[in-house]
Amino acid sequence: AQNITARIGEPLVLKCKGAPKKPPQRLEWKLNTGRTEAWKVLSPQGGGPWDSVARVLPNGSLFLPAVGIQDEGIFRCQAMNRNGKETKSNYRVRVYQIPGKPEIVDSASELTAGVPNKVGTCVSEGSYPAGTLSWHLDGKPLVPNEKGVSVKEQTRRHPETGLFTLQSELMVTPARGGDPRPTFSCSFSPGLPRHRALRTAPIQPRVWEPVPLEEVQLVVEPEGGAVAPGGTVTLTCEVPAQPSPQIHWMKDGVPLPLPPSPVLILPEIGPQDQGTYSCVATHSSHGPQESRAVSISIIEPGEEGPTAGSVGGSGLGTLA
């Protein structure tokens, strides 16, 4: 069968080989398409409800005034010339529709290095067959599931027209120290060959490099956090970051109801002050950062205290 590709909505003429150029003609067209079950026969004398879809012209050709998705299929003509010689024509018709230019919607203006970011969603509307969407970084194809690249795709079909809408959401994890203004674009590749890809306008988000946070240090005095009953413990939260963040205190994982301060003093230690303490530094540009936890305990005379603070957090104290 001869392969024919026709654009949806356009007319199509299929020639019936060997048919006399004008009536009387002995010919018959048979079609097996989305509009038929098995074969439908159309003859030159026809004319009727099928004319809107396909009709035999005076020269024996089959005319489809506006090809649709349901017209995909096989078209056969059997013709006999004046001498009684039979000729057969066989066509395989496939249809296509080029969508509008794809667009990137919900695009990010800024990405953060080192963490996954949504770059944007590429949308293509009105294609047939569905085709595919692909992403490019600085003109080179991006491969999903490689180097922090992930793509979420969705295909929908219009209930009336049968045309496809494709959506592709791109997530990337930019490398630290990489290109500060990467160029992303998306392209639609048609499902039928011999049609060039359609590319979106590019987008150029900025890549923001978060300053690596230095660790929050918690210093306990006396060292090890073991103190005799009635003694005093001083906890100091050291944060190298500038400007100085707000410091809050936790005991046994629960925030202490105290105003922010980098120093927590526990005077006249009693059993109620025992527990695990930590501090939380809150930066305006980053999230909260918690220190290691230290354990504060009471040692009875004659006991040896622990040599270092062990993991844990909280009891009310005085702030310096």
Partner: antibody, heavy 119, light 107 residues
Framework: EVQLVESGGGLVQPGGSLRLSCAAS????????MTWVRQAPGKGLEWVAS????????YYPDSVKDRFTISRDNAKNSLYLQMNSLRAEDTAVYYC????????????WGQGTLVTVSS | DIQMTQSPSSLSASVGDRVTITCRAS??????VNWFQQKPGKAPRRLIY???NLADGVPSRFSGSRSGTDFTLTISSLQPEDFATYYC?????????FGGGTKVEIK
């Protein structure tokens, strides 16, 4: 709202003529074939004529061929049926309906107009 | 010309009954059969298109099926508003041919 409204029916003598009209609204008229169907009193439905969306091609059953002419004016969203040489057996309610090809067939109907052929 | 033989020409049924109406085409018409409902003094209303598809706004108790050249309209549970005359229509070829109609009456 998609609507078809027929007019032009009435009493006519045998051998006489009558022109029915159908005003369409609520849809893109020139996208559809259009059809006339009739129903004699107490009888079933009978196809009378169809016309393609451009108006270039018309179709009739043998019972009305050469006597009836279907036409359309896409600019006016109107369908017409010119009936000549009327006979007693043409007495019926005449309905205008949207469609007439394999894509859309009689999905919307008008309320009908009565044609009586009698002396 | 294609003949559409519709049966029965009339039937009596009660509310809640399952009702089946059949049309047989004299030759292959593919899927190109519609079903219509008509009430006295009113225009026909399309119920089923292309043999099996329910038209917009039509209750789901109506359904259409096809087996070769036999076409069936089924009302799964007859309602008071379903008492009417039903017609099939073949539109694969001209002349377009309607079945003779089936009048559904209250038993």
């Amino acid at each position: 709202e998609v609507q078809l409204v027929e007019s032009g029916g009435g009493l006519v003598q045998p051998g006489g003529s009558l022109r029915l009209s159908c005003a369409a609204s609520g849809f893109t008229f020139n996208n559809y074939w259009m059809t006339w169907v009739r129903q004699a009193p107490g009888k079933g439905l009978e196809w009378v004529a169809s016309i393609d969306n451009s108006g270039d091609n018309t179709y009739y059953p043998d019972s009305v061929k050469d006597r009836f002419t279907i036409s359309r004016d896409n600019a006016k969203n109107s369908l017409y049926l010119q009936m000549n040489s009327l006979r007693a057996e043409d007495t019926a309610v005449y309905y205008c309906a949207r469609g007439g090809d394999i894509r859309v067939m009689l999905d919307v109907w008008g309320q009908g107009t009565l044609v009586t052929v009698s002396s | 010309d294609i003949q559409m033989t519709q049966s029965p020409s009339s039937l009596s049924a009660s509310v809640g009954d399952r009702v089946t109406i059949t049309c047989r085409a004299s030759q292959d018409v593919g899927i190109y059969v519609n079903w219509f409902q008509q009430k006295p003094g009113k225009a026909p209303r399309r119920l089923i298109y292309r043999a099996t598809n329910l038209a917009d706004g039509v209750p789901s108790r109506f359904s259409g099926s096809r087996s070769g050249t036999d076409f069936t309209l089924t009302i799964s549970s007859l309602q008071p508003e379903d008492f009417a005359t039903y017609y099939c229509l073949e539109f694969d070829e001209h002349p377009l041919t309607f079945g003779g109609g089936t009048k559904v009456e209250i038993k």
